[in-house]
Each structure stands twice: as structure tokens, then as C-alpha cells.
């Protein structure tokens, strides 16, 4: 972004920012914008919240166009009302082991996080909390309407999930990598993060990747076949180019996206992989960003609940990154 030209702002008055989000000047000192928050995409024009000690981390010098809002080295984390030091590990509940790193929290589930899809022997799986047990377990409900169970169920299969091996040891380093977090946006381009020490120095580091669960403009409910309640992985008719803050992917991609349900279930990525995508900007600059690509999606009732911070973080997370 060239800041040498005259300042002109959008025709609307200054935006109203959500509670806790600062109203700041853009990176050119021109226009008032709502500051980007931890983990959000940022540019020179869309700066991070300085009152929370955030800066726009552009990664490699070649990518000085779009970054991710990152806390300064050593920044503490506020999680569930408690302040944790950077580098501190803590068990947030019996279900999660978490680590604070430079203002970001990465957690590894201590319970099985598999997604159970309907099958002939268990057509209505449901997770329930059993007395005296921390981790929820799957139970099979009886169908309310027998006519639903039929030959169509043969199309369902139980999908495995692949996560990092938490006990991997390499050269005196216990390699630990948290799951990729849920995509920050339910539609359109977002950010997914994780914490890992899978590097030469065995130091904890934050990794981020772009993600798109589904395009915002797609009206997916229209594609649900008659008699069905979900469209798990809708077919995208033509290859698409990804857009990121005015920059466009150099290649076209026949990407898979997750669909929607009409019965209250949510469809989320089940197996994913991470690949580099090159974006070309209007000024000719090329930048490379890692991006999540969906292999399979799952539709389930484990939708994020506002009442449970962990469920919202981890039931929607990207299972089994196969990169």
C-alpha cells in the first residue's frame, strides 16, 4: 500500500467497532478502522490492535502485503479469565492440555475427538456425558421414525481421523503439535492456527494458514437433493481463483468445500491438507501463503456452542491434517 497519496476514506462515517475492539487509524494515518484482532488477517491499511500489543506479522519479507495479527514475543495469554505466561502449559479442563505462546493459546484434546457418522449398526450416533467421566462417549439412539433407515445408509461410512502423534520423540525433543484451530470464518477467507515445536531448535512456534470452509456467495441449501437434509461436500462446478485483500491466486483450483444441513447439523472439514498458494497483487507483487485444502467434510451435531469455549474451539477444528 502506497501511503504517499492524499488521504481519502470510505464515504460512510467512522465504523462502530464491537465491544473491546479499538477504533484506530489505518497504517497510512488516513482513515479510522476497527483494529484487527489476534489471529486475523491484517494489511498496512487494516492494522492490528495496538492497545493489545498486537502487530501485523507479514512472515517472510517477500510477503509484505498481508499478514496475521500476532502478539509481541513473550506476550501473556488471557484464557478463561486466567492470565498465563508465554511458554506456560496448563490443563484448561480435564479435556484439554494447552500452551500459551506469545499471546496465542494452542490446545491438544485429551479426549478422543473423532466424528462418528451414521452407519447401519448405529444410524443415530450422539455424544453424551456419562456420570463420573470427563470425556463424552458415543451412544446409539434408536431411530424415531423407522422409515428413515433403509438402503440409503449404505452410502455412509465411518471416517478415520488422523492427528499428530503426541509422543513423537526426535533428538531429545518431544515433538508436540496442536490441532489446527477452526477456521476463523464460517465462509470466505479466514485463518487457522496451531502451535508446534516441530523444528530444528525444538522451540514452540505459531503456524498459520489461510482457510475457506465454503464461499460466502454460494447458496448451498438450494443444492440439497429432495428428501435429503444435508449436502456434505457440494460439487463446485468450475475451478476458482482465491482472493486475498485484492490479490488473486495465480493458479485456479478445483477446491472442495463443506456444505450445509437444514436440520441443525453443521458441516465442517474432516480431513485437510496444507499447500502453498501464490497470490499476485495489482502492483505485480507475488506472495506465497500456506492454505488449507479440504479432502473430506463431516456433518454432525457437535456444532460450536456459545456456552463452551472449548467446544467452539475444537469441535470445529480441522481434523487430521495430512500435510
Amino acid at each position: 500500500q502506497n501511503c504517499s497519496g492524499p488521504c481519502r476514506c470510505p464515504d460512510e462515517p467512522a465504523p462502530r467497532c464491537p465491544a473491546g475492539v479499538s477504533l484506530v487509524l489505518d497504517g497510512c494515518g488516513c482513515c479510522r478502522v476497527c483494529a484487527k484482532q489476534l489471529g486475523e488477517l491484517c494489511t498496512e491499511r487494516d492494522p492490528c490492535d495496538p492497545h493489545k500489543g498486537l502487530f501485523c506479522d507479514f512472515g517472510s519479507p517477500a510477503n509484505r502485503k498481508i499478514g496475521v495479527c500476532t502478539a509481541k514475543d513473550g506476550a501473556p495469554c488471557i484464557f478463561g479469565g486466567t492470565v498465563y505466561r508465554s511458554g506456560e502449559s496448563f490443563q484448561s479442563s480435564c479435556k484439554y492440555q494447552c500452551t500459551c505462546l506469545d499471546g496465542a493459546v494452542g490446545c491438544m484434546p485429551l479426549c478422543s475427538m473423532d466424528v462418528r457418522l451414521p452407519s447401519p449398526d448405529c444410524p443415530f450416533p450422539r455424544r453424551v456425558k456419562l456420570p463420573g467421566k470427563c470425556c463424552e462417549e458415543w451412544v446409539c439412539d434408536e431411530p424415531k421414525d423407522q422409515t428413515v433407515v433403509g438402503p440409503a445408509l449404505a452410502a455412509y461410512r465411518l471416517e478415520d481421523t488422523f492427528g499428530p502423534d503426541p509422543t513423537m520423540i526426535r533428538a531429545n525433543c518431544l515433538v508436540q503439535t496442536t490441532e489446527w484451530s477452526a477456521c476463523s470464518k464460517t465462509c470466505g477467507m479466514g485463518i487457522s492456527t496451531r502451535v508446534t515445536n516441530d523444528n530444528a531448535s525444538c522451540r514452540l512456534e505459531k503456524q498459520s494458514r489461510l482457510c475457506m470452509v465454503r464461499p460466502c456467495e454460494a447458496d448451498l441449501e438450494e443444492n440439497i437433493k429432495k428428501g435429503k437434509k444435508c449436502i456434505r461436500t457440494p460439487k463446485i462446478s468450475k475451478p476458482i481463483k482465491f482472493e486475498l485483500s485484492g490479490c488473486t491466486s495465480m493458479k485456479t483450483y478445483r477446491a472442495k468445500f463443506c456444505g450445509v444441513c437444514t436440520d441443525g447439523r453443521c458441516c465442517t472439514p474432516h480431513r485437510t491438507t496444507t499447500l502453498p498458494v501464490e497470490f499476485k497483487c495489482p502492483d505485480g507483487e507475488v506472495m506465497k501463503k500456506n492454505m488449507m485444502f479440504i479432502k473430506t467434510c463431516a456433518c454432525h451435531y457437535n456444532c460450536p456452542g456459545d456456552n463452551d469455549i472449548f467446544e467452539s474451539l475444537y469441535y470445529r477444528k480441522m481434523y487430521g491434517d495430512m500435510a
Epitope: G5, P6, C7, A14, L25, G29
Partner: antibody
Framework: EVQLVESGGGLVQPGGSLRLSCAAS????????MAWVRQAPGKGLEWVAN????????DLLASLKSRFTISRDNAKNSVYLQMNSLRAEDTAVYYC????????????WGAGTTVTVSS | VVMTQTPLSLSVSLGDQASISCKSS???????????LEWYLQKPGQSPQLLIY???SRASGVPDRFSGSGSGTDFTLKISRVEAEDLGVYYC?????????FGQGTKLEIK
Amino acid sequence: EVQLVESGGGLVQPGGSLRLSCAASGFTFSDYYMAWVRQAPGKGLEWVANINYYGSRTDLLASLKSRFTISRDNAKNSVYLQMNSLRAEDTAVYYCARDTSRGSYFDVWGAGTTVTVSS
Amino acid sequence: VVMTQTPLSLSVSLGDQASISCKSSQSIVHYNENTYLEWYLQKPGQSPQLLIYKVSSRASGVPDRFSGSGSGTDFTLKISRVEAEDLGVYYCFQGSHFPLTFGQGTKLEIK
């Protein structure tokens, strides 16, 4: 009523200094950029400088940058133009103007204050 | 960016149409893709007042007999039915590139 009132003009010798003030009323001052525009006797309009909402960014006519400074005090609803090393060619009526920073530039103007640089 | 106005003076009868041209030495499209071309009127003994902004948008309180048009480097201000109160000097102005610049002015007189 939206109003801009300039003051501080007068007769000054070449090499001297003046500080122009502009008092704003009738609008939320910190929601607008402010600007100075001048007009030499019998001549056209010339943009001098403008300043953003909080004073953290200022833009001035390149030829005046070393001698002129624009600033603002939002608590006092005022914008200022500090003019140093004045020359005869700086003789003009200096207008204070409100800059919307959005669609249009100068939607409200003051009546102007006259600066005469002469020995 | 040099803004050149023609004619430099214009004499019209009341009720007639007046047209003023403004040419810029280069394209005045801002990096945000808007064109910040404005027209100001300075009546005798008064401060300038905004008439038109962003090429063709009328400022608040400006009569609809004033209209602006153009693109790229060529712009025009038209007054469809000139009234006595319209006399004065008209300036075009570009705010897309530094330095912000005004045209030299067109003096409108009533015949």
C-alpha cells in the same frame, strides 16, 4: 451553525514568523480533517496544507514544508498554521477549511485572514 | 498535476446555459479508484464555496441547475439557466494526487 473563524494575520517583515489560528464551532471537530488554502492578491486559490483527525499525519505543499507547520488541538477545537522565514510571495488571504476526508474536500470555509509580508 | 480551465472569462445572459471546461495534465483517478474532481465558486468579496465533488455529485444546498461531468482528464461544469447570484470565479480542483491543485479560475459575468 457550522463556523470557522481565522485569526493571527497581519503585517510582518520578510524573514519573520506568524501563527495563524482557526477556531471551529458547530460540529464535532475531531471527526474532520482540517486544511489551509491561500489566495494571493488578484490570484487564484492554492492549497497549503491539511491535517488528519488527530494531528498524526500532516501533508503540506512541498515548497512550503521547510517553513510552514500545520497542527491542531482537538480539546480547543482549533487548527494552526505556523509560518516561519516568511517571504513577500507568502502575502495572501489564508483560508481555514474543513476537509470531510471522505467524498469531498473543502465543504466549509472561514472568511480568511490576511497576511502581508513587506519591509 | 496542472489543471487548465477554459475559458478564463465568460459572459452570459440570464437564463442562458454556461459551460466551463477543466483539463488535467494527467489522469486524476485516486488509488482508491475514485476521481476527486471538484468545482468551487467564489462570489465577489466572499470565501469559496463547494458546488460539485467527485466529478458529478452536488454539494448540499446547491441548486440542480449546476451539473458536473467528465472522466480521465476532461471535465465540465454546466449551469443550465444562469441566475444573477451565479456570478463570480469558478475553480476546478483535483484531490487525487499531491500537490492538491486548483485551476486558474473562470470568471463568470452577466451580460
